[in-house]
């Protein structure tokens, strides 16, 4: 069903493994971390060289794109569906371009349904990117290019570009344009993560991993 | 500009059905969320039920689950509410509404409404 | 469901006089609040959304603030074209909900 189900298999290499919907026999192909921090992460995002289109649509965020082995977006509906079944985290790995590394690891985290716009629901940061959240709180509905949810008159997904669950526009967006090195400054619809590096500094890296708390 | 023009309304007897109207012209019907919001006579205002831009997801309020369906017609600019089994407290004024995006659960436009009478 | 209850439920005030109209929701709802104008036989007008964001074409003496479960719709100084009905509007979950109204009278 998720990765760390594939690793309590015997399955403890990193790689592309297929995950089942919950109480569904609907398959998705994701990363799995076999390694960090005991393994068992679902990867459900993640930048790395800006060869994915982040700009996508409503139906493509809801479906997942871009290629697991990659860039990639696994998919709202699949991750809603995930951890409404059960208590997940969620950890967020940073790279900026001076050979920093940095993360946020939320101790619950779930997605409402498509119902309420794929909701964030966030609780108990810890780690080093910020002592404040970067993905305000409460959580808000997903925004994309084609479907405006924010709380700005500005449309912060064509602004800033990217679906990402913006307020208004708020201090995060990992699903902002990717600026190779030395263009990566001074950037507002960058990739950016505003409680570690600022408003206008956009990152190198970005993951975005799930587990059950449990695990 | 954004128009919307409600039609249907008509006096009918409690269990007997009717279909709304909803004509959309002035922008790009396929890509908002649409919603039908009620007002009785005298009342203040009841939202009824939402549908997405592409028709994938329809949502109700309580009391007119199971027996109102919305729907659309993309092709058409068109946005219907069928409504069975009425009720006495169905009787209101129907109005369409557009969602400010494909989905975002307020409104942005209008229309004037369609009087609903229910009654024996 | 989520209540909104408005206050005052009517008011008169003049021509040129600052008016607020107050909406408390039974559950904070995050800023995911709508305020509408509406006249007598006529369809309602969208004037504010989450909160604070003025619809396209509504005059600048309207503005709304707010947070968790109390908002607050403001109107700076009375035209003779705004006394109406106003109405606050929830959509922070399903179903939506409406305020009861704040009917708006000449003094």
């Known amino acids: 069903r998720d990765c760390a189900e594939v690793f309590k298999s015997g399955h403890t290499t990193n790689g592309i493994y297929t995950l089942t919907f919950p109480n569904s026999t609907e398959e998705i192909k994701a990363y799995c971390d076999m390694e960090a921090g005991g393994g068992g992460w679902t990867i459900i995002q993640r930048r790395e060289d800006g060869s994915v289109d982040f700009q996508r649509t409503w139906k493509e965020y809801k479906v997942g794109f871009g290629n697991p082995s990659g860039e990639y977006w696994l998919g709202n509906e699949f991750v809603s569906q995930l951890t409404n079944q059960q208590r997940y985290v969620l950890k967020i790995h940073l790279k900026d371009w001076e050979g920093n590394e940095a993360y946020s690891l939320y101790e619950h985290f779930y997605l409402s349904s498509e119902e309420l716009n794929y909701r964030i629901h966030l609780k108990g940061l810890t780690g080093t990117a910020g002592k404040i959240s970067s993905i305000s709180q409460p959580g808000n509905d997903f925004s994309t290019k084609d479907g405006d949810n924010d709380k700005c008159i500005c449309k912060c997904s064509q602004m800033l570009t990217g679906g990402w669950w913006f307020d208004a526009c708020g201090p995060s967006n990992l699903n902002g344009m990717y600026y190779p090195q030395r263009q990566n400054t001074n950037k507002f619809n960058g990739i950016k993560w505003y409680y570690w590096k600022g408003s206008g500094y956009s990152l190198k890296a970005t993951t975005m991993m799930i587990r059950p708390a449990d695990f | 500009q954004v128009q919307l023009v409600e039609s249907g309304g008509d006096v009918v007897q409690p269990g007997r059905s009717l279909r709304l109207s909803c004509a959309a012209s002035?922008?790009?019907?396929?890509?908002?969320?649409m919603h039908w919001v009620r007002q009785a006579p005298g009342k203040g205002l009841e939202w009824v039920a939402i549908?997405?831009?592409?028709?994938?997801?329809?949502y109700y309020a309580d009391s007119v689950k199971g027996r109102f369906t919305i729907s659309r017609d993309n092709s058409k600019n068109t946005l219907y509410l069928q409504m069975n089994s009425l009720r006495v407290e169905d009787t209101a004024v129907y109005s369409c509404?557009?969602?400010?995006?494909?989905?975002?659960?307020?409104?942005?436009?209008w229309g004037q409404g369609t009087l609903v009478t229910v009654s024996s | 469901d989520i209540q909104m209850t408005q206050s005052p439920s009517s008011l008169s005030a003049s021509v040129g006089d600052r008016v607020t109209i107050t909406c408390r929701a039974s559950?904070?709802?995050?800023?995911?609040l709508a305020w509408f104008q509406q006249k007598p036989g006529k369809a309602p007008k969208s004037l504010i959304y989450?909160?604070?964001n003025l619809q396209s074409g509504v005059p600048s003496q309207f503005s709304g603030s707010g947070s968790g479960t109390d908002y607050t719709l403001t109107i700076s100084s009375l035209q003779p074209e705004d006394f109406a009905t106003y109405y606050c509007?929830?959509?922070?979950?399903?179903?939506?909900?409406f305020g009861q109204g704040t009917r708006l009278e000449i003094k």
């Open positions: 509404a557009r969602d400010f995006s494909i989905s975002s659960r307020h409104f942005d436009y």
């Open positions: 002035g922008f790009t019907f396929s890509s908002y969320g």
């Open positions: 549908i997405w831009y592409d028709g994938s997801n329809k």
């Open positions: 559950q904070a709802i995050n800023n995911y």
């Open positions: 989450a909160t604070s």
């Open positions: 509007q929830q959509y922070y979950i399903y179903p939506i909900t």
